[in-house]
Amino acid sequence: LKGQEFAPSHQQVYAPLRADGDKPRAHLTVVRQTPTQHLKNQFPALHWEHELGLAFTKNRMNYTNKFLLIPESGDYFVYSQVTFRGMTSECSEIRQAGRPNKPDSITVVITKVTDSYPEPTQLLMGTKSVCEVGSNWFQPIYLGAMFSLQEGDKLMVNVSDISLVDYTKEDKTFFGAFLL
Amino acid sequence: LKGQEFAPSHQQVYAPLRADGDKPRAHLTVVRQTPTQHLKNQFPALHWEHELGLAFTKNRMNYTNKFLLIPESGDYFVYSQVTFRGMTSECSEIRQAGRPNKPDSITVVITKVTDSYPEPTQLLMGTKSVCEVGSNWFQPIYLGAMFSLQEGDKLMVNVSDISLVDYTKEDKTFFGAFLL
Amino acid sequence: LKGQEFAPSHQQVYAPLRADGDKPRAHLTVVRQTPTQHLKNQFPALHWEHELGLAFTKNRMNYTNKFLLIPESGDYFVYSQVTFRGMTSECSEIRQAGRPNKPDSITVVITKVTDSYPEPTQLLMGTKSVCEVGSNWFQPIYLGAMFSLQEGDKLMVNVSDISLVDYTKEDKTFFGAFLL
């Protein structure tokens, strides 16, 4: 019995068959963040819950210090949603001293760090201008796509302003990846 | 020939191999909803088309009475998009009696119901403040993530206001899940 | 050793087992578009990068002339994000001649073309009214869902106005599909 008998007849099997339940997978959920001062052009990374509630990591996919560690080379689907909330936004007016931070945009970036490569790679970016004339506003940014990742790669989620991230519910802000 | 010979050499296969085309999958599309009285803090569930047009269920994934029934334990990717549409929204003004429904927010929740557990679990939430100063507005909320589900779990999509859901096209509002 | 011995005992394997790394997959990223005259009710297709940077096609999934070609029948997860950017939008005012394009909505459609079928099928649509009172605005529309596709089907991404698409970064605007 040859391995290729399981594959479609028109094509050779180049990779070993493997059980789906054995693939690296993670779904991480939001936790309370340190509400740091918003610095232009510097996007802080979020940290995450990895084992309580809906969160899990399995099959050698590990979470440590804001990073998801990729344990095996392959094609992964990577996704995140960040829900932001804020006060009335800037809408191009002059910012007044002492008033709470009024952003003119919100951004989420899923970033790949490869130790052998000096610069992080931005895999996905969701960016939105915010011009809300009402008082409080809130909205999610969702991202998801497939990437070829290498064993040892690290993934993180960066945001334009950590103090605007809604950390109150695990279903509002999350981050995940799974080997296809 | 041993099953583990198909797995990467560094790891034992713990789950049986199985054909991908045999996995539970569903993509449901929007249908006209029964208008319900908008109740504060109670989000009605949408019902769905499960066999016409782009919609399908397969491999023991069944749809019944607003619920997708999970036929087999495992990790599922679950997703939904709901397109909302409405008239000028509130923007923090006082709501006037008799005026058309002017929401100050729109919300989608994907909810898991487990018969043995009294409270439903909110898996995913997309929530957005609405402050549109023009006349008619419309916008989608998209959600998707991976969850460990158990055989017998039921999934539904709840919305903040069923009367604002755009039911006109199957590509605008949909709900799906597939076993990874 | 019979193939079905790898499947859960309650169910027959109807499809051949196959290595996951052998499945058709593509992730395409944005490139500078040819500006086209904005035609009402006719949404132009985007063209894409298919091999540089984060972009790739593999296992007989090919990209040609704005289309992703489906090489094998099966269930695919298909996704796209388009980031739009523009000047102050219409907000229901009368559009003035000679003023920069001020859209009142932005739309993304993932479309399937089947040669044997005269009309394209809209698989996914994300559409949003735009009423931004500030000056410049930008925002993404994300779409993703699972569809049963046939060998020979072609997928494309259409937008309401190609001149508003942000083509500056590969992580902002993208299109992908993979066989489940």
Partner: antibody, heavy 120, light 107 residues
Framework: QVQLQQWGAGLLKPSETLSLTCDVY????????WNWIRQPPGKGLEWIGE???????NYNPSLKSRVTISVDTSKNQFSLKLSSVTAADTAVYYC??????????????WGQGTLVTVSS | EIVLTQSPGTLSLSPGERVTLSCRAS???????LAWYQQRAGQAPRLLIY???SRATGIPDRFSGSGSGTDFTLTISRLEPEDFAVYYC????????FGQGTRLEIK
């Protein structure tokens, strides 16, 4: 040394609005959560809500409909308003700094407390 | 919301004795979000333990904390006269909650 000093009216009639302010001395205002906590006489502690330097609030669900917390970063102060008070709102009200670094969070500095009595 | 239940409600002990206070959560709590506070009569609470087991600055080493998941304990190895007070556990999730307190009184 960080110090939290709170002030506001101590005696209210039912249906009035409680108003307290907490001044923060000797530390950065950003990077922390600024909280209000109360303790009815002879009872335990109840968290009311919090605000950060961006003005983002998070309230106890049981009090949410009546609570407003605001911030003025230029004065390094934050304030609590609790509307439609009743005798059940009689308590010592504390302001406190919420410290979060990495994934560790706790209340590290507290105000001296203000006894607010609601009586007709 | 996460409910924290402390036991016992009151303890009567003598100086020099060892005491263990219990705090049980209605659902799993991140250890790093679990803190213990001491409140003496007429004073504001004072942080003793954070992250379930780390002593706050200036807290004597007779105080120690342990536990994970839903069960946490505060131990005082040798009671000093100034330790007689009320002790609260607290979780700092998205909606912080306190236990109802354990009163430690002199026998």
């Amino acid at each position: 040394q960080v110090q939290l000093q709170q002030w506001g009216a101590g005696l209210l009639k039912p249906s009035e609005t409680l108003s307290l302010t907490c001044d923060v001395y000797g530390g950065s205002f950003s990077g922390y959560y600024w909280n209000w906590i109360r303790q009815p006489p002879g009872k335990g502690l109840e968290w009311i809500g919090e605000i950060n330097h961006s003005g983002i609030t998070n309230y106890n669900p049981s009090l949410k409909s009546r609570v407003t917390i605001s911030v003025d970063t230029s004065k390094n102060q934050f304030s609590l308003k609790l509307s439609s008070v009743t005798a059940a709102d009689t308590a010592v009200y504390y302001c406190a700094r919420g410290y979060c670094r990495s994934t560790t969070c706790y209340f590290d500095y507290w105000g001296q407390g203000t006894l607010v009595t609601v009586s007709s | 919301e996460i409910v924290l239940t402390q036991s016992p409600g009151t303890l009567s002990l003598s100086p020099g004795e060892r005491v263990t206070l219990s705090c049980r959560a209605s659902q799993s709590v991140r250890s790093s979000y679990l803190a213990w506070y001491q409140q003496r009569a007429g004073q504001a609470p004072r942080l003793l333990i954070y992250g379930a087991s780390s002593r706050a600055t200036g807290i004597p080493d007779r105080f120690s904390g342990s536990g994970s998941g839903t069960d946490f304990t505060l131990t005082i190895s040798r009671l000093e006269p100034e330790d007689f007070a009320v002790y609260y556990c607290q979780q700092y999730g998205s909606s912080p909650t306190f236990g109802q307190g354990t009163r430690l009184e002199i026998k």
